[in-house]
């Protein structure tokens, strides 16, 4: 889609006649028709296929067309199309002369032509004027003619169609070409992806706008490559998302178990020097002259026995005085570098010097982890039985109690209970959820067939004479024990008077 | 036991300022990223603001940006929230809670009310 | 901004009661979803983070499921304590948001 522009700059008919050669009355009222069609090798007659304009009068005889023309008429004239430019035209340009107001074609005489003129060729898309001029007999007509592209249509031939937009389909502007060119910030082949904060973290960070980080569940910071902390953690960090990595002093699941109780709460009086001994436990060495718990009772001097780590005690006037061992210092000869010789590791750890005794490392024995081998470790918390198994911890290792019906490591794989033929006595196995069931053969019971039920052969007496019936229980027949006197299966015959 | 304790709130005049505290305890404040919310009278919860903990890095929600201002003072174990050009419509009752606008807001405060009339 | 709608808005029940409660939102936010208590002039209190997680200290009688848009709560025996409102509250999409709330009452 574009528009053919015609600028009339100039036209001259000096002697005021038209193409007949016959003069004008009183002088030649100008107006032109313009054609504009397809190309044609020799321009002829016929529609104008890509449009036509008719300008109202311009000037009489010869004068010059000022752009955008007073008394209605626009220059340049607008010859818009709606297709594809084909590159090629051809175009008639046709001067008349108005006797009146009405310029219609049916209502001007055949002879008012003053003038006619036809070119064609190729013309490119452009913003750049081709001028021309065209000179007859009697006439000469100026012009300059171009073709430019509608709003919103780009390219060669004005066939892309692009139009400007920042909103939530896309942020550009278009380039010459119809091609998309992003707003600053915007990237993506329609320019809707926001370019984010320049450092932002690939995976953790996002942005919904430009220059944006925004993080993901479980970062933050500026560059969303900081993680956040357990939801439950107190006194711990993080190395990946929702982690409680504890600081020095705290141990527990959360982090909430206070291994530093003499830091945290001061719980010594009187001076008195406080060594942690485990979770939320401490132990206070008091000054000389105080005891209890917390080294808030008075004693006298030496009494107390003050001094620590085998100091001897020296009474003085002003109180006392501690002669340390080796290796000791302080008032109380309390203080040695923190080393193993403080029994640091818990449940079991065993203790390593490092740096010549100025520091130390635990090694935990299975089950237990941390600094300070503090925390238990419970192997069951990713939930790893399936089918409602139940998780163990078993040591440094778990293990999965199966539901009926369920088998292997993770109780992950269905055990046909009938599998294994378990009806005994041809009974029938029926695999449920909640185990199998045998249904048994007459004469036998039990939850697996296993029970043989005698079936009680006398129970329709089937002996007479007051025989005695009993049930043969390996062909579940009655067998009569007959009485003196009588014979027969059912002892029905007396002794003497046999069957007839 | 964690701790947090909002001070700071009262009355102001639309177009006024306002300074609300937040003291912590209870925990390594330097550990984590802090929020607050707030509530209208009557209403639901509405997040506010957000600092990291890493490096102090603010988030506010749209309505906000522009005239409140979180920060932190981590040796003091203590959360800001400086709100000027004061809207009816900031008044609530505002939190401080533990948390980041990705991640649940484990533990709050009591909450301090602020109101913005003339 | 993701919208989280909660319903009943309010819900009257006893003691001893199974209560449910739902929450949906407009979008997508995995399993990235909180439940928060609230009774009359104090602070909101952590339930249930990432759907059905109990935070420390939320007794086993409440429990939470779902994923995705839809989402539930649920309290298998009301206890004369748990009469408060409830928020849902999404984390996956900033900004955070939040349901407008259930009040349940006693009935």
């Known amino acids: 889609s574009g528009v053919f522009q015609l600028q009339l700059q100039e036209f001259v008919n000096e002697r005021g006649v038209l193409a007949s050669g016959r003069p004008c009355e009183p002088g030649c009222r100008t107006f032109f028709r313009v054609c504009l069609k397809h190309f044609q090798a020799v321009v002829s007659p016929g529609p104008c296929t890509f449009g036509s304009v008719s300008t109202p009068v311009l000037g009489t005889n010869s004068f010059a067309v000022r752009d955008d023309s007073s008394g209605g008429g626009r220059n340049p004239l607008q010859l818009p199309f709606n297709f594809t430019w084909p590159g090629t035209f051809s175009l008639i340009i046709e001067a008349w002369h108005a006797p009146g107001d009405d310029l219609r074609p049916e209502a001007l005489p055949p002879d008012a032509l003053i003038s006619k003129i036809a070119i064609q060729g190729s013309l490119a898309v452009g913003q750049n004027w081709l001028l021309d001029e065209q000179t007859s007999t009697l006439t000469r007509l100026r012009y300059s003619y171009r073709v430019i592209c509608s709003d919103n249509y780009y390219g060669d031939n004005c066939s892309r169609l692009c139009k400007k937009r920042n909103d939530h389909f896309g942020h550009y502007v278009c380039q010459p070409d119809g091609n998309l060119s992003c707003l600053p910030g915007w990237t993506g082949e329609y320019c809707q992806q926001p370019i984010c904060l320049s450092g932002c973290h690939e995976q953790n960070g996002y942005c919904s706008k430009p220059a944006e980080c925004l993080c993901r569940p479980g970062w933050q910071g500026r560059l969303c490559n900081e993680c956040i902390p357990h939801n439950g953690c107190r006194h711990g960090t993080c190395s990946t998302p929702w982690q409680c990595t504890c600081d020095e002093g705290w141990g527990g699941l959360f982090c909430d178990q206070d291994l530093n109780y003499c830091t945290h709460h001061s719980p010594c009086k009187n001076g008195a020097t406080c060594s942690n001994s485990g979770q939320r436990s401490y132990t206070c060495t008091c000054r000389p002259g105080y005891t209890g718990v917390d080294c808030e009772l008075e004693l006298s001097e030496c009494d107390s026995n003050p001094c620590r780590n085998g100091g001897s005690c020296k009474d003085q006037e002003d109180g006392y005085h501690c002669l340390c061992p080796p290796g000791y210092y302080g008032l109380h000869c309390e203080h040695s570098t923190l080393s193993c010789a403080d029994s640091p590791c818990f449940n079991g750890g065993s203790c390593r010097e490092r740096n010549q005794g100025a520091s130390y490392a635990c090694e935990c024995p299975p089950n237990f982890t941390g600094s300070n081998c503090e925390k238990k470790v419970d192997r069951c918390t990713s939930n790893p039985c399936a089918n409602g198994g139940q998780c163990l911890n078993r040591g440094p290792s778990r293990m999965c109690r199966c539901r009926p019906g369920f088998t292997g490591t993770y109780c992950e794989r269905h055990v046909s209970d009938c599998a294994r033929n378990p009806c005994a006595h041809g009974g029938t196995c029926h695999d449920l959820e909640s185990g199998l069931m045998c249904t048994c053969p007459a004469g036998f019971s039990g939850r697996r067939c296993e029970v043989r039920t005698s079936i009680d052969a006398c129970a329709s007496s089937p002996c007479f004479n007051r025989a005695t019936c009993y049930t043969d229980l390996s062909t579940d027949t009655f067998v009569c024990n007959c009485p003196y006197g009588f014979v027969g299966s059912r002892c029905e015959f007396p002794v003497g008077l046999p069957p007839s | 036991e964690v701790q947090l304790v909002e001070s700071g709130g009262g009355l102001v005049q639309p177009g006024g300022s306002l300074r609300l505290s937040c003291a912590a305890s209870g925990f390594t404040f330097r550990n984590f990223p802090m929020a607050w919310v707030r509530q209208a009278p009557g209403k639901g919860l509405e997040w506010v603001a957000t600092?990291?903990?890493?490096?102090?890095?603010?988030t506010y929600r749209d309505s906000v940006k522009g005239r409140f201002t979180i920060s932190r003072d981590n040796a003091k174990s203590s959360l800001y929230l400086q709100m000027n050009s004061l809207r009816a419509e900031d008044t609530a009752v505002y939190y401080c809670?533990?948390?980041?606008?990705?991640?649940?807001?484990?533990?709050w405060g009591q909450g301090t009310l602020v109101t913005v009339s003339s | 901004d993701i919208q989280m709608t909660q319903s009943p808005s309010s819900l009257s029940a006893s003691v001893g009661d199974r209560v449910t409660i739902t929450c949906r939102a407009s979008?997508?936010?995995?399993?990235?979803l909180a439940w928060y208590q609230q009774k009359p002039g104090k602070a909101p209190k952590l339930l249930i983070y990432d759907t059905n997680n109990l935070a420390d200290g939320v007794p086993s009688r409440f429990s939470g499921s779902g994923s995705g848009t839809d989402f539930t709560l649920t309290i298998s025996s009301l206890q004369p304590e748990d009469f408060a409102t409830y928020y849902c509250q999404q984390y996956n999409n900033y900004p955070p948001t939040f349901g407008q709330g259930t009040k349940l009452e006693i009935k």
């Open positions: 600092i990291s903990s890493s490096d102090g890095w603010p």
């Open positions: 809670s533990r948390g980041y606008y990705n991640s649940p807001f484990a533990y």
């Open positions: 979008e997508d936010i995995y399993s990235n």
